[in-house]
């Protein structure tokens, strides 16, 4: 059985989001804006 | 100063398969970038197809590109797209871009046509 | 998935004038939103990201807006230059399908 709890959508709690990482100077060598932590 | 350029694009059968490749130049891939593909039809919108990490290899797909589309990192300054089953819905300027910035390449176009 | 819905499609200004681009998700993506610039031909520039940040060397004219599920991008003080096709994307999750586009505005500069 599947113990982990589920909203009511479905997805799993806890399933922490991957944002695409921004580069806002963008053709120079930089590094990317930082993830949010967000669950 | 960094670039990327797509190259692989041309004409191509229905039900055909075809590489993209991106290359960076003024830097390379190692260091963990997010490297996407886009594509925009003939006088219609942007459509984002996934992305991938270049550190980790993991790769991320819109849901109509899963199963159809292949991201793969294949060296330091190149990443690939491979399309299978090809459709006259395919046909398009495919761009690669370094994650969320300005940095896209020009574009190489897909004709997907008997 | 993340539907962008962006209106109007196309909109008509006067030079000095002011347009207004709605671009509204169909979840929350916080502020993970950007908008991006096209001519014809050439790939897509990034003007702003995080919904309000502009991006370097990008004209103060140009202005982003709003949190959660509504945004806009305001120009003002149109220029012939800024007559192209504006997108907006979220970025709120590459794992989840949430990476689409907005369908698009053309601006025409009168």
């Known amino acids: 059985s599947y113990s982990m709890e589920h909203f009511r959508w479905g997805k799993p709690v806890g399933k922490k989001r991957r944002p695409v990482k921004v580069y806002p100077n963008g053709a120079e060598d930089e590094s990317a804006e930082a993830f949010p932590l967000e669950f | 100063q960094q670039q990327l350029e797509e190259s692989g694009g041309g004409l191509v059968k229905p039900g055909g398969t075809l590489t993209l490749t991106c290359k960076a130049s003024?830097?390379?891939?190692?260091?963990?970038?997010?490297i996407c593909w886009a594509r925009q039809g003939p006088g219609k919108g942007l459509e984002w197809i996934g992305c991938?990490?270049?550190?980790?290899?993991?790769t991320y797909y819109a849901s109509w590109a899963k199963g159809r589309f292949t991201i793969s990192r294949t060296s330091s300054t190149t990443v690939t797209l491979q399309m299978t089953s090809l459709t006259a819905a395919d046909t398009a300027t495919y761009f690669c871009?370094?994650?969320?910035?300005?940095?896209w390449g020009p574009g190489t176009l897909v004709t997907v046509s008997s | 998935d993340i539907v962008m819905t962006q209106t109007p499609a196309s909109v008509s200004e006067p030079v000095g004038g002011t347009v207004t681009i709605k671009c509204q998700a169909s979840?929350?993506?916080?502020?993970?939103l950007a908008w991006y610039q096209q001519k014809p031909g050439q790939p897509p520039k990034l003007l702003i990201y995080?919904?309000?940040k502009l991006t370097s060397g990008v004209s103060s004219r140009f202005k982003g807006g709003g949190t959660g599920t509504q945004f806009t991008l305001t120009i003002s003080d149109l220029e012939c230059a800024d007559a192209a096709t504006y997108y907006c994307?979220?970025?709120?999750?590459?794992?989840?399908?949430?990476?689409?586009f907005g369908g698009g505005t053309e601006v025409v500069v009168k």
């Open positions: 994307q979220t970025y709120y999750d590459i794992s989840d399908d949430g990476c689409t």
């Open positions: 003024g830097f390379s891939f190692s260091s963990g970038y997010d």
């Open positions: 871009a370094k994650g969320i910035s300005s940095l």
């Open positions: 991938i990490d270049t550190g980790s290899g993991n």
């Open positions: 995080a919904a309000s």
């Open positions: 979840q929350t993506i916080s502020s993970d």
